[in-house]
């Protein structure tokens, strides 16, 4: 890989676990300024594999609120507005990083945690297993 | 909201920006042990709104590699295997948190950053505007 020289202005770390424990500035920089504000706003309702959004709250996690998608149907909505069970609605999942307070209830100490969230649903052709 | 008492075993912070700057342990705890490892593995190909995955790499970011979905078609795949433009493939986007090295090239100092990523695609009914 590319070796990038260390910036001489980096803060020192006297933590014995360095570089596993790092300093993180929580003033979030938002890179999304140029994105289309409409984004996925109403896709959950207009999709052929519609979903509901459920609030998942955990004060020991940062961010404390995460929205989880749950597909409304097992099948997909066809042109007549009916659920077609020849197709399947499935959740699209993504692993994301969150910060978990560690030790618990500490305001200034966290551990990185990987969690799996469902972001929305998509309609897929089912894998059909025929009986011999 | 619920007030949780501070744990007396929390580390002290002498940083003047506290609580904006916190300590984070990068030994990731993975909560996904019970998830189906196949997960969304082949949905990108079986979906009626299929997508390709593009690798986005940035050594100044943690995680340095993020996969971005790009919908393959404007329309959706119908039962005949044709792309149907009466329906629209659209990306499902999600805001995620990443760590950005700050100052640049520093191994132990980061800032939280919010970025928008496309996770997959879904098929939606278009909003049709006819000319009067």
């Amino acid at each position: 890989g590319i070796t990038i020289p260390r910036n001489p202005g980096c803060p020192n770390s006297e933590d014995k676990n360095f570089p596993r424990t790092v300093m993180v500035n929580l003033n979030i920089h938002n890179r999304n300024t140029n994105t289309n504000p409409k984004r996925s706003s109403d896709y959950y309702n207009r999709s052929t594999s519609p979903w509901n959004l459920h609030r998942n709250e955990d004060p020991e996690r940062y961010p404390s609120v995460i929205w989880e998608a749950k597909c409304r149907h097992l099948g997909c909505i066809n042109a007549d507005g009916n659920v077609d069970y020849h197709m399947n609605s499935v959740p699209i999942q993504q692993e994301i990083l969150v910060l978990r307070r560690e030790p618990p209830h500490c305001p200034n100490s966290f551990r990185l945690e990987k969690i799996l969230v469902s972001v929305g649903c998509t309609c897929v052709t089912p894998i059909v297993h025929h009986v011999a | 909201g619920i007030t949780i008492p501070r744990n007396p075993g929390c580390p002290n912070s002498e940083d003047k920006n506290f609580p904006r700057t916190v300590m984070v342990n990068l030994n990731i705890h993975n909560r996904n042990t019970n998830t189906n490892p196949k997960r969304s593995s082949d949905y990108y190909n079986r979906s009626t709104s299929p997508w390709n995955l593009h690798r986005n790499e940035d050594p100044e970011r943690y995680p340095s590699v993020i996969w971005e979905a790009k919908c393959r078609h404007l329309g959706c795949i119908n039962a005949d295997g044709n792309v149907d433009y009466h329906m629209n493939s659209v990306p499902i986007q999600q805001e995620i948190l990443v760590l950005r090295r700050e100052p640049p090239h520093c191994p132990n100092s980061f800032r939280l950053e919010k970025i928008l990523v496309s996770v997959g695609c879904t098929c939606v009914t278009p909003i049709v505007h006819h000319v009067a």
């Epitope: 289309n36 409409k38 896709y43 207009r46 | 299929p50 790009k70 919908c71 393959r72 078609h73 404007l74 795949i77 295997g81 044709n82 792309v83 433009y85 629209n88 493939s89 659209v90 990306p91 939606v124 278009p126 909003i127 049709v128 505007h129 006819h130 000319v131």
Partner: antibody
């Protein structure tokens, strides 16, 4: 560099079928889609069909029952078959590359092959 | 299918003048993903069409900056700031938000 070259019979009798081949170079059919477009003498362009890199297709609905598109990725060839030709199918037939993102535009075109339907 | 209407049919201009081509669609070309798939092509006499502008306003590689595209929804314009002799030919607009269709073309000729 990117090139597309159409080859066809030139003359087709009414009610017969037409088969045209588009041979491409400078890019792979596993990465790019290919469109067929035609242009009757002195007239505008009419889009016919596209075959995408993943093998899916989209047809002009008015002509769908008469058209068939296939490809051979290893030979870098795309094939168009059109049935039941009539005199108004006389046109220059072009193949064109889709610009890589599946839905933007046709960035490179062949020089076309002239097809005359006549007895 | 979406009908693309181009005006005028013929556009006589003097070399060095500005030329403006209009294209109107029978329904909005804004896709659910927020993009607008409206493109412009030039077909010179005896040649196949060449891509000039894609997605309303993006110049294709090698296209001079005297060509510019604008518009939204259903109304679009292609402008040539200073017409040169090599610009003569028929200009077609095309949409690919829906099943692709082309306009009838506008012929650019010298006054």
């Amino acid at each position: 560099q990117v090139q597309l070259k159409e080859s066809g019979p030139g003359l087709v009798a009414p009610s017969q079928s037409l088969s045209i081949t588009c041979t491409v170079s400078g890019f792979s059919l596993t990465t790019y889609g290919v469109h067929w477009i035609r242009q009757p003498p002195g007239k505008g362009l009419e889009w016919l069909v596209v075959i995408w890199s993943d093998g899916y297709t989209t047809y002009n609905s008015a002509l769908k029952s008469r058209l068939s598109i296939t490809k051979d990725n290893s030979k870098s060839q795309v094939f168009l078959k059109m049935n039941s030709l009539q005199t108004d199918d006389t046109a220059m037939y072009y193949c064109a590359r889709n610009d890589g993102d599946y839905f933007y535009s046709m960035d490179y075109w062949g020089q076309g092959t002239s097809v005359t339907v006549s007895s | 299918d979406v009908v693309m209407t181009q005006t005028p049919l013929s556009l006589p201009v003097s070399l060095g003048d500005q030329a403006s081509f209009s294209c109107r669609s029978s329904q909005s070309l804004v896709h659910s993903n927020g993009n607008t798939y409206l493109h412009w092509y030039l077909q010179k006499p005896g040649q196949s069409p060449k891509l000039l502008i894609y997605k309303v306003s993006n110049r294709f590689s090698g296209v001079p900056d005297r060509f510019s595209g604008s518009g939204s929804g259903t109304d679009f314009t292609l402008k040539i700031s200073r017409v040169e002799a090599e610009d003569l030919g028929v200009y077609f607009c095309s949409q690919s938000t829906h099943v692709p269709t082309f306009g009838g073309g506008t012929k650019l000729e010298i006054k």
